[in-house]
C-alpha cells in the first residue's frame, strides 16, 4: 500500500498506473530499432545510438538527459591482419586454418562493421606448440590435470570449452599453469540443446558460430589504465605493463566445426571421466599433442589484435524526486553489443526505454516520484563494465551518500521458462510482494500470479512455498554499485529451465546470430516475457523511488547471515585438528550474527510503529535502511582485490559470474591443505573471521536506536 500514498502531488498515480502504461508492442518496436546494425563500444554507430536515446528520453519527459564520456582502453582485431589458428606440419606449412569470420545470417550479408570473433584484450603473439585439452579450464580442471594426471601445461597451448565459469577465469588459470596460449571453443554439449535446430531454423548454435567476449581479470577496477579514478581528460594513465587485469598470453575463440579439426587428432592421456567429454565425435584425449600419425604436427596461433584508448559514452537521464531529490534510485543497463545484440543487451535496453517512456508519461501528467530516479545507458560493458564503473568512480562521493538502490537491466531474457532474480537480501520482500501482484506470462498459469509460477518452476532450496533468489556475483553493471560502493542492488530476467537445459548461457550468446529475429521468432514472439521483466524491473524502481518507507527488510539479511556463517563454519570444520592447533573459532562471528538478528528484529518493530508523518524521523529511519548495505563495505577491500569491498558477498575468485558469501574467509580456507605454511594460512583464516565479525557487528549497530 505504501506506493499509493507516495506523494501528495498526485496520489492517483500509483504503481498500477505506471505498470498499465508499459506495452509489449513498444518493447518489440524498440528492440527492432536497436538491433539493425552493430553497436560495438567505441564505434561511431554506438555514439549515434547514444544520441538517439538521449533525444528520445528527453521526448519521453525526463528532466535532463546528458552524455558522459570517458577515454578507456578497448581492444579490436586488426582489420588487415586477421586472427586465426592453424595446424602446421613439420615443415611449418599451414595444413588447416580456422575461419576468419562467422557466416552472416540471412538478410545481414551486406551489413558492414561486423567485428569478427576475437577475445578482447588478448595480447598479440604467434605461439606454437602441442595442444592440451583442459575441459572448462576451471580451478578443479587444472587440479585434475596437474595433481592427478601429472600433465604439465607449461609451454603448451591449451584448448578449453566455454561454459560453467567466466572466460577470464579460464585464461587466468591457464596462465598460472604456464600455458603459452588459450583456444576457447563452444562445445555442442554446452551450446546445442537436444531437439532444437541451429539458427536460423532454431535457437541453437551453428558450427560456424563463435562466442566473443573479454578475457580480463579486472576484479572491479574498471578501465585498466585508471583504476579507482574516472578516465577523464586529466586522468593519469598507467603504462600497458602496469595495466590492471590484462592477460599475458594470446587467446582466441572458435566454433565447434573448427574445434573438431583440432580435437580429433588429440593423443596423449585419455579424458579422466565423462564430465570431461563433450558432444563432438572426437576422443576428448587430453594430450599433450596429437596422436601417432600426427604427432609431428603443431598448433600455431596468429593473434594481431590491438588495444587502444577510445572514447565511450554513457547516457544519464534524471527524473527529479519531489520530496527527497537527494536520494537516488538507479536503473541502468548497457547499450554496447558485440554485434547486433538481439538479446545482449538490447532486450534489456528496449525494456529500459519503455520504462522511461512510462515514467515520462506519468511525469507529463503532473506526477513525480518521491525520490530521484536516474536512468543509465552504459557503454563498454562488454569490455569490462567500463562505462558504469567510470561513471560510478566519477560520482562515487554522491553515490555513497545518496544511493538508495541500483536495479540492473541487461538482457531481459536468457530463456522463456521462468523468472530469475539475484539481489541483496534487503530486496527479497520487495520482490516477493511485487511478483504476487503481477500476472504470470507462463502457459498453464493464466490468471495466476508471477510469484506462483516462479515458485513452482524455481523453488527455493531452503524455504518451501517460496521461489529461489540467488546471490549477486558479477559480470554485469551492478558490480561497482554493489561490490565497491555498497548500494543495495538487484537484477531480474526471464531464464531457461536449468533442470533440463544444461548448456551454459544461451547458445547464441555473443555471436552474430543474436538478432532481432532470434527473439521474435524463437524466444518471445508476443514479447510477453519482456513485458513481465519490464514490470518487475520497473515495479522495483517505482517502489524504491516512491514508498514512503524504503521497501527494505533487514530481517532477511539476518537470516542469510546465519546461513552463510553456518556454511563457512562447516567448510572450516573439515579441518578439526587445525582449528584446534591454531585456535580457530567462529564463536565471535556467530555472536555478531546473533546480535545483528536481535537488533534487526527490534529495528523492524520500531519501523512498524514510528510516526510516519514526522519527516525527520522518517528520514532517519530510511537513512538507517539505506546505509545498511553500505555498512558491509570494508574500505580496505578483500585481499588482492581492493575494489571488491563487500564483506558478505563478492564474485567468486574461481568464477566472476558467481557470488560467494563471506568471500574473505572462503578464499582463506580454499585448498588450505595444499598451503606450504599452515601457521600463516590459518592465521589468515583467523584474520578474515575477525574482519567478518567486526563488519557484521558494526552493521548491526547502524540499526540500533541512534541515541
Amino acid at each position: 500500500k505504501s506506493s499509493s500514498e507516495a506523494t501528495n502531488i498526485t496520489p492517483k498515480h500509483n504503481m498500477k498506473a505506471f505498470l498499465d502504461e508499459l506495452k509489449a508492442e513498444n518493447i518489440k518496436k524498440f528492440l527492432h530499432n536497436f538491433t539493425q546494425i552493430p553497436h560495438l563500444a567505441g564505434t561511431e554507430q554506438n555514439f549515434q545510438l547514444a544520441k538517439q536515446i538521449q533525444s528520445q528520453w528527453k521526448e519521453f519527459g525526463l528532466d535532463s538527459v546528458e552524455l558522459t564520456h570517458y577515454d578507456v582502453l578497448l581492444s579490436y582485431p586488426n582489420k588487415t591482419h586477421p586472427n586465426y589458428i592453424s595446424i602446421i606440419n613439420e615443415d611449418g606449412n599451414e595444413i588447416f586454418n580456422t575461419s576468419l569470420f562467422e557466416p552472416p545470417p540471412a538478410g545481414y550479408e551486406n551489413v558492414s562493421d561486423i567485428v569478427p570473433p576475437f577475445s578482447a584484450f588478448s595480447p598479440q603473439g604467434m605461439p606454437e606448440g602441442d595442444l592440451v585439452y583442459v575441459n572448462y579450464a576451471r580451478t578443479e580442471d587444472f587440479f585434475k590435470l596437474e595433481r592427478d594426471m601429472k600433465i604439465n601445461c607449461s609451454g603448451k597451448i591449451v584448448i578449453a570449452r566455454y561454459g560453467k565459469v567466466f572466460r577470464g577465469n579460464k585464461v587466468k588459470n591457464a596462465q598460472l599453469a604456464g600455458a603459452t596460449g588459450v583456444i576457447l571453443y563452444s562445445d555442442p554439449a554446452d551450446y546445442f540443446a537436444p531437439g532444437v535446430k541451429s539458427y536460423p531454423d532454431g535457437w541453437n548454435l551453428p558450427g560456424g558460430g563463435v562466442q566473443r567476449g573479454n578475457i580480463l581479470n579486472l576484479n572491479g577496477a574498471g578501465d585498466p589504465l585508471t583504476p579507482g579514478y574516472p578516465a577523464n581528460e586529466y586522468a593519469y594513465r598507467r603504462g600497458m605493463a602496469e595495466a590492471v587485469g590484462l592477460p599475458s598470453i594470446p587467446v582466441h575463440p572458435i566454433g565447434y566445426y573448427d574445434a573438431q579439426k583440432l580435437l580429433e587428432k588429440m593423443g596423449g592421456s585419455a579424458s579422466p571421466d565423462s564430465s570431461w567429454r563433450g558432444s563432438l565425435k572426437v576422443p576428448y584425449n587430453v594430450g599433450p599433442g596429437f596422436t601417432g600419425n600426427f604427432s609431428t604436427q603443431k598448433v600455431k596461433m596468429h593473434i594481431h589484435s590491438t588495444s587502444e584508448v577510445t572514447r565511450i559514452y554513457n547516457v544519464i537521464g534524471t527524473l527529479r524526486g519531489a520530496v527527497e531529490p537527494d536520494r537516488y534510485v538507479i536503473l541502468g543497463g548497457h547499450r554496447d553489443s558485440w554485434v547486433f545484440g538481439g538479446i545482449d543487451p538490447q532486450s534489456g535496453a528496449a525494456v529500459v526505454h519503455e520504462i522511461v517512456r512510462s515514467f515520462g508519461t506519468l511525469k507529463k501528467e503532473g506526477w513525480r516520484p518521491r525520490r530521484t530516479i536516474l536512468f543509465a545507458s552504459w557503454d563498454a560493458e562488454e569490455f569490462g563494465l567500463l562505462g558504469s564503473t567510470e561513471w560510478a568512480e566519477e560520482n562515487s562521493r554522491l553515490l555513497q551518500e545518496r544511493g538508495v538502490a541500483y536495479i540492473n537491466a541487461d538482457s531481459s531474457i536468457e530463456g522463456n521458462y521462468t523468472l530469475r532474480v539475484d539481489c541483496t537480501p534487503l530486496m527479497y520482500s520487495l520482490v516477493y510482494n511485487l511478483t504476487k501482484e503481477l500476472e504470470s506470462p507462463d502457459e498453464g498459469f493464466e490468471g495466476k500470479s508471477l510469484y506462483e509460477s516462479w515458485t513452482k518452476k524455481s523453488p527455493s532450496p531452503e524455504f518451501s512455498g517460496m521461489p529461489r533468489i540467488s546471490k549477486l556475483g558479477s559480470g554485469n553493471d551492478f558490480e561497482v554499485f554493489f561490490q565497491r560502493l555498497g548500494i543495495a542492488s538487484g537484477r531480474a530476467r526471464y531464464t531457461k529451465n536449468w533442470e533440463t537445459n544444461k548448456f551454459s548461457s544461451y547458445p547464441l550468446y555473443h555471436s552474430v546470430y543474436e538478432t532481432y529475429e532470434l527473439v521474435e521468432k524463437f524466444y518471445d514472439p508476443m514479447f510477453k516475457y519482456h513485458l513481465t521483466v519490464a514490470q518487475v524491473r520497473g515495479g522495483m524502481v517505482f517502489e524504491l523511488a516512491n514508498s514512503v518507507v524504503l521497501p527494505f527488510d533487514c530481517r532477511d539479511y539476518a537470516v542469510v547471515l546465519r546461513k552463510y556463517a553456518d556454511k563457512i563454519y562447516n567448510i572450516s570444520m573439515k579441518h578439526p585438528q587445525e582449528m584446534k592447533t591454531y585456535s580457530v573459532s567462529f564463536d565471535s562471528l556467530f555472536s555478531a550474527v546473533k546480535n545483528f538478528t536481535e537488533i534487526a528484529s527490534k529495528f523492524s518493530e520500531r519501523l512498524r510503529d514510528f510516526d510516519k508523518s514526522n519527516p525527520i524521523l522518517l528520514r532517519m529511519m530510511n537513512d538507517q535502511l539505506m546505509f545498511l548495505e553500505r555498512a558491509f563495505i570494508d574500505p580496505l577491500g578483500l585481499p588482492d582485490r581492493p575494489f571488491y569491498r563487500h564483506v558478505i558477498y563478492a564474485p567468486s575468485s574461481h568464477n566472476k559470474y558467481a557470488g560467494e558469501s563471506f568471500p574473505g574467509i572462503y578464499d582463506a580456507l580454499f585448498d588450505i591443505e595444499s598451503k606450504v605454511d599452515p601457521s600463516q594460512a590459518w592465521g589468515e583464516v583467523k584474520r578474515q573471521i575477525s574482519v567478518a565479525t567486526f563488519t557484521v557487528q558494526a552493521a548491526a549497530e547502524t540499526l540500533s536506536e541512534v541515541a
Partner: antibody, heavy 116, light 107 residues
Framework: EVKLEESGGGLVQPGGSMKLSCVAS????????MNWVRQSPEKGLEWVAE??????????HYAESVKGRVIISRDDSKSSVYLQMNNLRAEDTGIYYC???????WGQGTTLTVSS | NIVMTQFPKSMSISVGERVTLTCKAS??????VSWYQQKPEQSPKMLIY???NRFTGVPDRFTGSGSATDFILTISSVQTEDLVDYYC?????????FGGGTKLEMK
C-alpha cells in the same frame, strides 16, 4: 603442533622386506598428502614415494629407483602412513623420514640398514 | 629428472658475516623451490618455500630469492647455530629432487 613419528626401521638382509610406519598428530591427517624421503651419505636426500588424500583417490607416486619394490599406503582412521619395502638392496640403506606435503614437516626418521 | 646443484659444497665463515648459498636447477622450475636447514642428528627443517617465502618461525636473517633455474639463500648475519647443513629442493614436478647440500663451517 604437527608431529610425525616413524618406526619400523632396523637391519635387514638384501632381498628381504620391511614395513615402515609413521603416525601423525596435530593436524587433520585425512586431508593431507604424505611422503617418504630418505637420506644416505652416498645419495643425500632422496624422495621415495607420495600418497595423496581420498579426494585425490589416494593416488600414489614413486621414485624410479624403488618402483615395483615399494608400496606406500595410509590408514586415515589411524592417522598413519606406511612404506612396505620388498626385495631390499644395499643402496636402500638410510634414514627414512615421513614428511607432509611439500616436505614442510618432517619426522625424526627411522634407520633402515640393508646388509648381509 | 630435474637435477638440483648446490654450491659451494662447503664454506668457512665467521659469525656476523653475510653468506650466500646458491642452487641451480637443470631446467625451469618456476618458483617451486624450498630451502631446508639440517642440524646434526636432526631431521631437515623448512626455512623458505616458493623460492622467497619465509616459513613460520624462521628468523628474518634468512632470505630466499630467484626463479626459473637460479636460486639463492642469503643469511644476512650468520649466528653460531646457523653453522649447519642447507639443502634446496624442487617440488615442480616428479620426481621431487634435492640438492647435494652446502655445509657451513666456522672459519
Amino acid at each position: 603442533e604437527v608431529k610425525l613419528e616413524e618406526s619400523g626401521g632396523g637391519l635387514v638382509q638384501p632381498g628381504g622386506s620391511m614395513k615402515l610406519s609413521c603416525v601423525a598428530s596435530g593436524f587433520t591427517f585425512s586431508n593431507y598428502w604424505m611422503n617418504w624421503v630418505r637420506q644416505s651419505p652416498e645419495k643425500g636426500l632422496e624422495w621415495v614415494a607420495e600418497i595423496r588424500s581420498q579426494s585425490n583417490n589416494f593416488a600414489t607416486h614413486y621414485a624410479e629407483s624403488v618402483k615395483g619394490r615399494v608400496i606406500i599406503s595410509r590408514d586415515d582412521s589411524k592417522s598413519s602412513v606406511y612404506l612396505q619395502m620388498n626385495n631390499l638392496r644395499a643402496e636402500d640403506t638410510g634414514i627414512y623420514y615421513c614428511t607432509r606435503r611439500w616436505n614442510n614437516f618432517w619426522g625424526q626418521g627411522t634407520t633402515l640398514t640393508v646388509s648381509s | 629428472n630435474i637435477v638440483m646443484t648446490q654450491f659451494p659444497k662447503s664454506m668457512s665463515i665467521s659469525v656476523g658475516e653475510r653468506v650466500t648459498l646458491t642452487c641451480k636447477a637443470s631446467e625451469n622450475v618456476g618458483t617451486y623451490v624450498s630451502w631446508y636447514q639440517q642440524k646434526p642428528e636432526q631431521s631437515p627443517k623448512m626455512l623458505i618455500y616458493g623460492a622467497s617465502n619465509r616459513f613460520t618461525g624462521v628468523p628474518d636473517r634468512f632470505t630466499g630469492s630467484g626463479s626459473a633455474t637460479d636460486f639463492i639463500l642469503t643469511i644476512s648475519s650468520v649466528q653460531t647455530e646457523d653453522l649447519v647443513d642447507y639443502y634446496c629442493g624442487q617440488s615442480y614436478t616428479f620426481p621431487y629432487t634435492f640438492g647435494g647440500g652446502t655445509k657451513l663451517e666456522m672459519k
